[in-house]
């Protein structure tokens, strides 16, 4: 058993029917001695007396908040949750293995630059008592400072038959180079309740690692005389790092027709201009990637043809 | 249809070039000894990320540009950043601080350079012959050398009396992959930005 | 005391379906994930299908994906396995299992697909 | 399909040391806990070692288990008539998990 903060706690179990659970002692946090009673969550029914309480903790009933009184008065709360470990493995029912980029990836984060900021997010089918707690820092055994903000819920889908929800949080390197090179990763780690459920959840990478650069700005088409050619520019994103000619993009160019089954032309280009021929119903779209760094392409950036 | 990109004019600045190639060779190296061995622990993940230049060099330092100079966490080991202007090119006129830059991009390489022949020297004895280094990246890495044109006393090649451990030699391999790409990338940013300045 | 009793299997034609059920008592049910296993006549064992504890998950192996679903009723304390377009190479003894570091195995129940 | 390999079979007279060793890989054994199941011919599998070196109550102290880097073993100290059977390591694997990974399975004859 272990504080999670003031007056709660988390029961580690090793989860399996007829596991013999885990004893717990509580004590009412009181100066008094005499005349103390116990009850669990809203029954009234008297679970023992004396200043500690010693419980068997087994199943989820036997979580919950056990309060300590006297004579009609709340003396002091314990809330008690449960942390389950099937199998040598701690449990993740809460959140959604998203399976980007592999298997059992619970927490996806990317960043638009190398400043030390970067935003996580989540899923889960939970819509009710549910909160979340996040922590980061740059590595484990010295960790160094991240400042992550509240975990918000950022979005809402329809999945089949079930709705499913998305949680993002924010979170900033107190003291980033953007043009160190990382050798400590970024720990990432989420605390989930659900009613009296428990679950923690980790997610360890270099920032170089998740770059994500917003899409190109600006993309503008200029019509070359006397040709079916155009000439394609388009500009750094603002949130991408500074100076552009240390912290490079490459972009691709594509060419697409109306429909999805059309061939499409591409063209890889460190310029922030190329030229292409712009078919009739096409659409250019231009992508943007670290020059120098292969990690995530930019989503893409569109205007039509015509 | 994928076509090729266009490679910028590399008469002006030829470290630039060189830089490129090399970030090039050392990324197809990694991936090569990724696939080749895949039952090490060679992935990103699972590697202890060691820097061999570390406190021997100080290149993210030295070569700092002067944009971020005003950023407070990138000047905490360092007292002056480089005032960019000039190139690999002999003919012009280098700064002081460009030159230490440089010099300390020619340390880097020396640096990876004995430790890639001294490894490549190990693997050459597995009975294995799983993996050796690529030719084309240790030339690279020379040609770069030759184009920063330092003269720097010859470090010797480290030779070792005792029964190589292949496994360990392996896992290092990675460990060394892994950094140097990681410096090849900033060696890359840093051409690119003395090639704008 | 866990218990865990199996029924449903049988012989079959190729191409054919069959049902096996689990019925489980001596514990909280629907606390528990539960997992199908099978082991053919003189071969090793073979993990099939995973459940979570409310149904919101399955696993499947991939020699049974698309073919067999896993399933639960909660609030009957059993276990399903449904499998459709058998093949000869289904031919086994199946048991259904509880999933944490102490498990508990069914009896096993032989399914057989022959013409 | 099996990514737990075992040797096919192993034998030892009564009273002997018998080891049955299972190999496996980073993302399976080496990341996650081993089993060791015994299976009787016609019955169900019964659980001997859980969490790599941990006995269910019941288990005689003659079976122990044991894990290093990458493979697992079950040892049989002063083996019995009544231990001959067949013996299965079970884990996971970090990329399938709750998938149930099986060892090829080793006979165990008492000559």
């Known amino acids: 058993i272990w504080e999670l903060k003031k007056d709660v706690y988390v029961v580690e179990l090793d989860w399996y029917p007829d596991a013999p659970g885990e004893m717990v002692v509580l004590t009412c946090d009181t100066p008094e001695e005499d005349g103390i009673t116990w009850t669990l969550d809203q029954s009234s029914e008297v679970l023992g007396s004396g200043k500690t309480l010693t419980i068997q903790v087994k199943e989820f009933g036997d979580a919950g908040q056990y309060t300590c009184h006297k004579g009609g008065e709340v003396l002091s709360h314990s809330l008690l949750l449960l942390h389950k470990k099937e199998d040598g493995i701690w449990s993740t029912d809460i959140l959604k293995d998203q399976k980007e980029p592999k298997n059992k990836t619970f927490l996806r984060c990317e960043a638009k630059n190398y400043s030390g900021r970067f935003t996580c997010w989540w899923l889960t089918t939970i819509s009710t008592d549910l909160t979340f707690s996040v922590k980061s820092s740059r590595g484990s055994s010295d960790p160094q400072g991240v400042t992550c903000g509240a975990a918000t819920l950022s979005a809402e889908r329809v999945r089949g038959d079930n709705k499913e929800y998305e949680y993002s949080v924010e979170c900033q390197e107190d003291s980033a180079c953007p043009a160190a090179e990382e050798s400590l990763p970024i720990e990432v780690m989420v605390d989930a309740v659900h009613k009296l459920k428990y679950e923690n959840y980790t997610s360890s990478f270099f920032i170089r690692d998740i770059i994500k650069p917003d899409p190109p700005k600006n993309l503008q088409l200029k019509p070359l005389k006397n040709s079916r050619q155009v000439e394609v520019s388009w500009e750094y994103p603002d949130t991408w790092s500074t100076p552009h000619s240390y912290f490079s993009l490459t972009f691709c160019v594509q060419v697409q027709g109306k429909s999805k089954r059309e061939k499409k032309d591409r063209v890889f280009t460190d310029k922030t201009s190329a030229t292409v021929i712009c078919r009739k119903n096409a659409s250019i779209s231009v992508r943007a990637q670290d020059r120098y760094y292969s990690s995530s392409w930019s989503e893409w950036a569109s205007v039509p043809c015509s | 249809r994928n076509l090729p990109v266009a490679t910028p004019d590399p008469g002006m600045f030829p470290c630039l070039h060189h830089s490129q190639n090399l970030l090039r060779a050392v990324s197809n190296m990694l991936q090569k000894a990724r696939q080749t061995l895949e039952f090490y622990p060679c992935t990103s993940e699972e590697i202890d990320h060691e820097d061999i230049t570390k406190d021997k060099t100080s290149t993210v330092e030295a070569c700092l540009p002067l944009e971020l100079t005003k950023n407070e966490s990138c000047l905490n080991s360092r007292e002056t950043s480089f005032i960019t202007n000039g190139s690999c090119l002999a003919s012009r006129k280098t700064s002081f601080m460009m030159a230490l830059c440089l010099s300390s991009i020619y340390e880097d390489l020396k640096m990876y350079q004995v430790e890639f022949k001294t490894m490549n020297a190990k693997l050459l004895m597995d009975p294995k012959r799983q993996i050796f280094l690529d030719q084309n990246m240790l030339a690279v890495i020379d040609e770069l050398m030759q184009a920063l044109n330092f003269n720097s006393e010859t470090v010797p090649q480290k030779s070792s009396l005792e029964e190589p451990d292949f496994y360990k030699t392996k896992i290092k391999l990675c460990i060394l992959l892994h950094a140097f790409r990681i410096r090849a990338v900033t060696i890359d940013r840093v051409m690119s930005y003395l090639n704008a300045s | 005391q866990v218990q865990l009793v199996q029924s449903g299997g049988g012989v079959v034609q190729p191409g054919r379906s069959l049902r096996l059920s689990c019925a489980a008592s001596g514990f909280t049910f629907s606390s528990y994930g539960m997992h199908w296993v099978r082991q053919a006549p003189g071969k090793g064992l073979e993990w099939v299908a995973f459940?979570?504890?409310?149904?919101?998950?399955?696993y499947y192996a991939d020699s049974v994906k698309g073919r067999f679903t896993i399933s639960r009723d909660n609030s009957k304390n059993t276990l399903y396995l449904q499998m459709k377009s058998l093949r000869a190479e289904d031919t086994a003894v199946y048991y259904c299992k509880t999933h944490g570091s102490h498990d508990n195995w069914g009896q096993g129940t032989m399914v057989t697909v022959s013409s | 399909s099996y990514v737990l390999t075992q040797p096919p079979s192993v034998s030892g007279t009564p009273g002997q040391r018998v080891t049955i060793s299972c190999s496996g890989g980073r993302s399976n054994i080496g990341n996650n806990t081993v089993k060791w199941y015994q299976q009787l011919p016609g019955t169900a599998p019964k659980l001997l070692i859980y969490?790599?070196?941990q006995r269910p109550s019941g288990v005689p102290d003659r079976f122990s288990g044991s894990k290093s880097g990458t493979s697992a073993s079950l040892a049989i100290t002063g083996v019995q008539a009544e231990d001959e059977a067949d013996y299965y390591c079970?884990?996971?694997?970090?990329?399938?998990?709750?998938?149930?990974?099986f060892g090829t399975g080793t006979k165990v004859t008492v000559l």
């Open positions: 969490g790599n070196d």
């Open positions: 079970q884990s996971y694997d970090r990329g399938t998990h709750p998938a149930l990974l």
């Open positions: 459940i979570r504890y409310d149904g919101s998950n399955k």
